[in-house]
């Protein structure tokens, strides 16, 4: 069975940011800004075609 | 620091797991200057099919 889509799980640290409780709440400005920056960054990185998008963003303390 | 975890979706056959990681790692310097994000400890793995079928590419 093939979906025509490949999925990859990716994790990384952002060492110059501090985790706080607002990153547990998707309604906060901090969460939304970071999510927007990360989404935009991935569109830049994988702009060569084939990239369909990203999902399931989670933030955790490092 | 903040640990970020997410799922990336690509059209099947257009990229291998090595290039997903390599292309991300090669962008780290630009991420620091453009987004002020200092990225480290990058890890990439393929998602087993049963999970990927549920996760969508939203």
């Amino acid at each position: 069975l093939s979906t025509g889509v490949s999925f990859f799980f990716l994790s990384f640290h952002i060492s110059n940011l501090q985790f706080n409780s607002s990153l547990e709440d998707p309604s906060t400005d901090y969460y939304q800004e970071l999510q927007r920056d990360i989404s935009e960054m991935f569109l830049q990185i994988y702009k060569q075609g084939g990239f369909l998008g990203l999902s399931n963003i989670k933030f955790r303390p490092g | 620091s903040v640990v970020v975890q997410l799922t990336l979706a690509f059209r099947e056959g257009t990229i291998n797991v090595h290039d997903v990681e390599t292309q991300f790692n090669q962008y780290k310097t630009e991420a620091a200057s453009r987004y002020n994000l200092t990225i480290s400890d990058v890890s990439v793995s393929d998602v087993p099919f049963p999970f990927s079928a549920q996760s969508g590419a939203g």
Epitope: S6, Q48, G49 | G13, I15, N16, H18, T22, Q26, D46
Partner: antibody, heavy 120, light 107 residues
Framework: QVQLVQSGAEVKKPGASVKVSCKAS????????MHWIRQAPGQGLEWIGY????????HYNQKFKDKATLTADKSASTAYMELYSLRSEDTAVYYC?????????????WGQGTLVTVSS | DIQMTQSPSSLSASVGDRVTITCRAS??????LVWYQQKPGKSPKLLVY???TLTDGVPSRFSGSGSGTQYSLTISSLQPEDVATYYC?????????FGSGTKLEIK
């Protein structure tokens, strides 16, 4: 037409180094990744590593990270592989091979091979 | 590292025979599987990529199939010029390992 022309056969003493070249023509050198593969006499193929001549990014098979260094000269459209601390087990034919362009996960063109013989 | 186990290591068949070579990966390589043909004293030549896509100029008697960890290369009607050693290669993750090869001979 695309061509990868490698330097000639070499005979080296144990402990010596050797630099093998791979001259590319017929395409834009900086837009294709160049890989190196070795084949010991009568044996199979073993992947050494690659260089992206556009960015000079290299990636090595861990087995060869202290054995080989890959470089590229954009102006000469030539890739190089230098092998260090040669031992008799390094006697092999060494190939350069071009990886196809975007989303092309295969080696579409190969050099003719360079035989490196290590013997005292 | 992903190990590629190729079988058989050698094979003798008659002209016109249907021949199948198999390659098993130690992990899922998601169809990033390549087949090469190497004739004695020559460089390898690309036959099949993405597990089943035949490269330009390769005769249609060659075909690739498989998915996940199991792949095969089939020659539907063996010809004298097919005498060679055939290698599979993992192109999913580094190191981009090769199978140990299958030496094909004519009976």
């Amino acid at each position: 037409q695309v061509q990868l022309v490698q330097s000639g056969a070499e005979v080296k003493k144990p402990g010596a180094s050797v630099k093998v070249s791979c001259k590319a023509s017929g395409y834009t050198f900086t837009t294709y990744t160049m890989h190196w593969i070795r084949q010991a006499p009568g044996q199979g193929l073993e992947w050494i590593g690659y260089i992206n001549p556009g960015s000079d990014y290299t990636h090595y098979n861990q087995k060869f990270k202290d054995k080989a260094t890959l470089t590229a000269d954009k102006s000469a459209s030539t890739a190089y592989m230098e092998l260090y601390s040669l031992r008799s087990e390094d006697t092999a034919v060494y190939y350069c091979a071009r990886q196809g362009n975007y989303a092309a996960y295969y080696f579409d063109y190969w050099g003719q091979g360079t035989l490196v013989t290590v013997s005292s | 590292d992903i190990q590629m186990t190729q079988s058989p290591s050698s094979l003798s068949a008659s002209v016109g025979d249907r021949v199948t070579i198999t390659c098993r990966a130690s992990g899922n390589i998601h169809n990033f599987l390549v087949w090469y043909q190497q004739k004695p004293g020559k460089s390898p030549k690309l036959l099949v990529y993405n597990a089943k896509t035949l490269t330009d100029g390769v005769p249609s008697r060659f075909s690739g199939s498989g998915s996940g960890t199991q792949y095969s290369l089939t020659i539907s009607s063996l010809q004298p010029e097919d005498v060679a050693t055939y290698y599979c290669q993992n192109f999913w993750n580094v190191p981009f390992t090769f199978g140990s090869g299958t030496k094909l001979e004519i009976k």
